[in-house]
């Protein structure tokens, strides 16, 4: 996260982190929690990684230096990529984690509400997304969790911003005009939640960018809402019954 | 299976022109940007031009600037290029070749990842 | 423009031996735009590397790419006889998108 702050403990208990296990272990990618034994995040965080026992969920934590190799995480039973997704394409950036035993909710770990399908009319004005990216382009991983927030921005304004890509329906983007306040590398697959009504409600997924937090070059996240019925289907016909967060 | 087939090359005399066509299948072309690479006989490998998915944004090597033309119909799956004043120096065999525009560490990839076989066009008098 | 030099020009080498090519670029770039490609005569260029160190689809495993910023480099652990041509790194980091000389890699 660029232009970001330190985040406290249980402030977005939602979200995880995705690490690797090879010779060494690193995190490359942030989720979120949306059910007991589900997690939401982007597809291209398993490009060239699909084995499922390489990866490593740690949820309810703050501080990556305080893993050590006692710390509790989660092992994946089921990585399912939306069946449209490409590794030559920008669209369809969302994948599903089957968590191999369901976690319990706690004040640092539970999940975040999902929003309604294909929700378009709400207008959300108070936006935040978090994660444990590079700090600066050319940076490096943070300890604490960050947030920073940043205001959406219409469809039509990110495809001026973006002529060499198609910005669709099923994109949501999110920046500051003058730059200065985004997500970065390591941030992929991590959550854009906005509060409306009292409640948060996870609107995207982080995606991809031009660089990081430069000047009219927004953050582009995946619209959840665009993805609902493929988020029931697919944790519904694994579950036989969904224990998802919808919103109430 | 993604395929890629130029046409339109041949013998032309400097000063004037020549349309290449590339027709594309195997894969949803209105949702990629498209290039044409040119190779002269002998030499290595040169970028001519690229068009967006949508054909509002193109770009050119200044060698060519001013003198050709890229464009698409995404309803025929086809990709253009319009070659007028043609010199000596643009003769070489044109690839036309789709834009791999994924995404890695939330940023976009960009490469080349399918070629057609080429096309040979020979500016000569 | 963004420069792409690649060293050496040729390299001869026997079936098995290591290959190690080189590509040096005139300024920053962005590892998800570089790209290695192989050419054989008569044939179109086969996408090898991509993200500076990503095999394309079918690549085999000999084939491994490295390098950040300015210095990019593509190895052959073995070399089997069909790998013998030309290789070639490219950016599309910044129009225009540029390739380098080539590196010929013959059999000794």
């Known amino acids: 996260i660029v232009g970001g702050t330190n985040s406290s403990w249980g402030e977005w208990p939602w979200q995880v982190s995705l690490q690797v296990k090879l010779t060494a272990q690193r995190h490359l990618c942030g989720g979120s929690l949306i059910g007991h034994q589900w997690v939401l995040t982007a597809a291209h965080c398993f490009d060239g990684l699909p084995l499922q026992d390489v990866w490593r969920i740690y949820s309810g934590i703050l501080n990556l230096s305080d893993i050590t190799k006692d710390t509790p995480f989660s092992q994946i039973k089921e990585i399912i990529i939306h069946q449209n997704y490409k590794v030559s394409e920008g669209n369809h950036d969302i994948a599903l984690i089957k968590l191999q035993a369901p976690l319990n909710y706690t004040e640092f770990q539970k999940p975040i509400c999902l929003p309604s399908k294909g929700d378009t009319s709400t207008i959300y004005t108070n936006c935040w997304v978090t994660g444990w990216g590079f700090s600066k382009e050319k940076g490096e991983i943070q300890n604490i969790l960050q947030k920073v927030n940043i205001p959406l921005v219409t469809n039509e304004e990110c495809q001026k911003r973006y002529q060499d890509y198609k910005i669709t329906q099923r994109m949501v983007c999110a920046g500051y005009k003058e730059g200065g306040k985004d997500a970065c590398k390591g941030d992929s697959g991590g959550p854009l939640v906005c509060k409306h009504n009292g409640m948060w409600r996870l609107v995207g997924i982080t995606s991809w960018g031009e660089g990081c937090a430069r000047r009219e070059q927004p953050g582009v996240y995946t619209k959840v809402a665009e993805y609902m019925d493929w988020i029931l289907e697919k944790t519904q016909s694994s579950d036989g019954k969904a224990q998802m967060q919808s919103p109430a | 299976e993604v395929q890629l087939l130029e046409s339109g090359g041949g013998l032309v005399q400097p000063g004037g022109s020549l349309r290449l066509s590339c027709a594309a299948s195997?894969?949803?072309?209105?949702?990629?940007?498209m290039q044409w690479v040119r190779q002269a006989p002998g030499k290595g490998l040169q970028w001519v031009s690229y068009?967006?998915?949508?054909?509002?944004?193109?770009g050119y090597a200044d060698s060519v600037k001013g003198r050709f033309t890229i464009s698409r119909d995404n309803s025929k799956n086809t990709l253009y290029l319009q070659m007028n004043s043609l010199r000596a120096e643009d003769t070489a065999v044109y690839y036309c070749?789709?834009?791999?525009?994924?995404?890695?560490?939330?940023?976009?990839?960009?490469?080349?990842?399918?070629w057609g076989q080429g096309t040979l066009v020979t500016v000569s008098s | 423009d963004i420069q792409m030099t690649q060293s050496p020009g040729t390299l001869s080498l026997s079936p098995g031996e290591r290959a190690t090519l080189s590509c040096r670029t005139s300024q920053f770039v962005n590892s998800n735009y570089l790209a290695w490609y192989q050419q054989t005569p008569g044939q179109a260029p086969r996408l090898l590397i991509y993200g500076a160190s990503s095999r394309a689809t079918g690549i085999p495993d000999r084939f491994s790419g490295t390098g950040y910023g300015t210095d990019f480099t593509l190895t052959i652990s073995r070399l089997e006889p069909e790998d013998y041509g030309t290789y070639y790194c490219q950016q599309s980091s910044r129009t225009p998108w540029t390739f380098g000389q080539g590196t010929r890699v013959e059999i000794k």
């Open positions: 068009i967006s998915p949508s054909g509002g944004y193109t």
């Open positions: 195997g894969f949803t072309f209105s949702n990629y940007t």
């Open positions: 070749a789709r834009v791999a525009r994924g995404i890695a560490a939330r940023s976009r990839t960009s490469y080349f990842d399918y």
